[in-house]
């Protein structure tokens, strides 16, 4: 499935210029490669869209409605999370059921845990009817235990 | 390493505006949000508000809002607070303090700017 | 409006105690609460995230603990310089909020 990373660069708290980049996310925009890196907290989220309707073009992403929604929606991350310590979202699937849609977002690891994660979405939820067009309901957000997610240890500079 | 500088203390007459500034260094400025806080004297913290550089995005406390209005200069890496028709409540220290998202935690602070509303 | 309701409001110590501070939301907020020590004329200094989670360069004697709406932070044994307020402030829902605090003062 295409995935979205959030491209921006950032200065890390020792000022040195770095692109975010984590696997297993890659952007067709990214200007350097991603590199693994540890330190990544990941979530797995899964939502309705409640006024529209999944049909078979849901499942190629070749088509034009796949392509648009899944354009809407990682647009719709990076301004729900903006970008401090959002690194990005992958595994976009889309189900039957209304649209049911699940995907993964990764956090540099420390900044943000499962319940500001769903908490930061429902807030947006008014804003992406409005915006996007976009009917949300039932939220559900969980931990991913990523293998290559470090342990929790020091917390990371806010 | 990063560093919030405030501007220094005012004295307003009441019903007069007042616009601190929170000159930051040693990250990116533009991602991350920067929150105001509000600290009456002997009292509590108060969050007023946020302001996302990067698009000038913002989110206030319901009870501030019309009265603080939050601004951030990419240019020069500094966020604004700009608060109007001071009364005597107004009285505070006002710290800026920066966080990772919309509802987080601040690990970085000012030092705190001091107005007092006073005829 | 999440209230975060401290106690208590003021709090007599001796060093080498152990002290404990408790914070109480008007709501479930999972973990989402983060503790802070405030000296006079100082800016607060964030001292636990995520109710338990350490933050680097604060001293392991400070610990945290709680989810759903009881939530408490621990000076395992309480230095001198550790004479300040203490709030907390959650991050679950808009407006955030803090505690009124918890004063600590030498017996």
């Known amino acids: 499935t295409p995935t979205t990373l959030a491209s921006h660069s950032t200065k890390t708290d020792a000022s040195s210029t770095h692109h975010s980049s984590v696997p297993p996310l890659t952007s067709s925009n990214h200007s350097t490669s991603p590199q693994l890196s540890t330190g990544v907290s990941f979530f797995f989220l899964s939502f309705h869209i409640s006024n529209l309707q999944f049909n078979s073009s849901l499942e190629d992403p070749s088509t034009d409605y796949y392509q648009e929604l899944q354009r809407d929606i990682s647009e719709m991350f990076l301004q729900i999370y903006k970008q401090g310590g959002f690194l990005g979202l992958s595994n976009i699937k889309f189900r039957p059921g209304s649209v049911v849609v699940q995907l993964t977002l990764a956090f540099r690891e420390g900044t943000i845990n499962v319940h500001d994660v769903e908490t930061q979405f429902n807030q947006y939820k008014t804003e992406a009817a409005s915006r996007y067009n976009l009917t949300i309901s039932d939220v559900s957000v969980s931990d991913v235990p990523f293998p290559f997610s470090a342990q929790s240890g020091a917390g990371v500079p806010g | 390493q990063v560093q919030l500088v405030q501007s220094g203390a005012e004295v307003k007459k009441p019903g007069s505006s007042v616009k601190i500034s929170c000159k930051t260094s040693g990250y990116a400025f533009s991602n991350f949000w920067m929150n105001w806080v509000k600290q009456r004297p002997g009292q509590g913290l108060e969050w007023i508000g946020q302001?996302?550089?990067?698009?000038?995005?913002?989110n206030y406390n319901g009870k501030f809002k019309g009265r603080a209005t939050l601004t951030a200069d990419k240019s020069s890496s500094t966020a604004y607070m700009e608060l109007s028709s001071l009364r005597s409540e107004a009285t505070a220290v006002y710290f800026c303090?920066?966080?990772?998202?919309?509802?987080?935690?601040?690990?970085?602070w000012g030092q705190g700017t001091l107005v007092t509303v006073s005829s | 409006e999440i209230l975060l309701t401290q106690s208590p409001d003021f709090q007599s110590v001796t060093p080498k105690e152990k002290v404990t501070f408790t914070c109480r939301a008007s709501q479930s907020i999972g973990t989402s609460i983060h503790w802070y020590q405030q000296k006079p004329n100082q800016s607060p200094k964030l001292l636990i995230k995520y109710a338990s989670e350490s933050i680097s360069g604060v001293p392991s004697r400070f610990s945290g603990s709680g989810s759903g709406t009881d939530f408490t932070l621990t000076i395992n044994s309480l230095e001198s310089e550790d004479i300040a307020t203490y709030y907390c402030?959650?991050?679950?829902?808009?407006?955030?909020?803090f505690g009124q605090g918890t004063k600590l003062e030498i017996k």
């Open positions: 302001i996302y550089p990067g698009d000038g995005d913002t």
């Open positions: 402030q959650q991050s679950n829902n808009w407006p955030l909020t």
């Open positions: 303090a920066r966080s990772y998202y919309r509802s987080a935690w601040f690990a970085y």
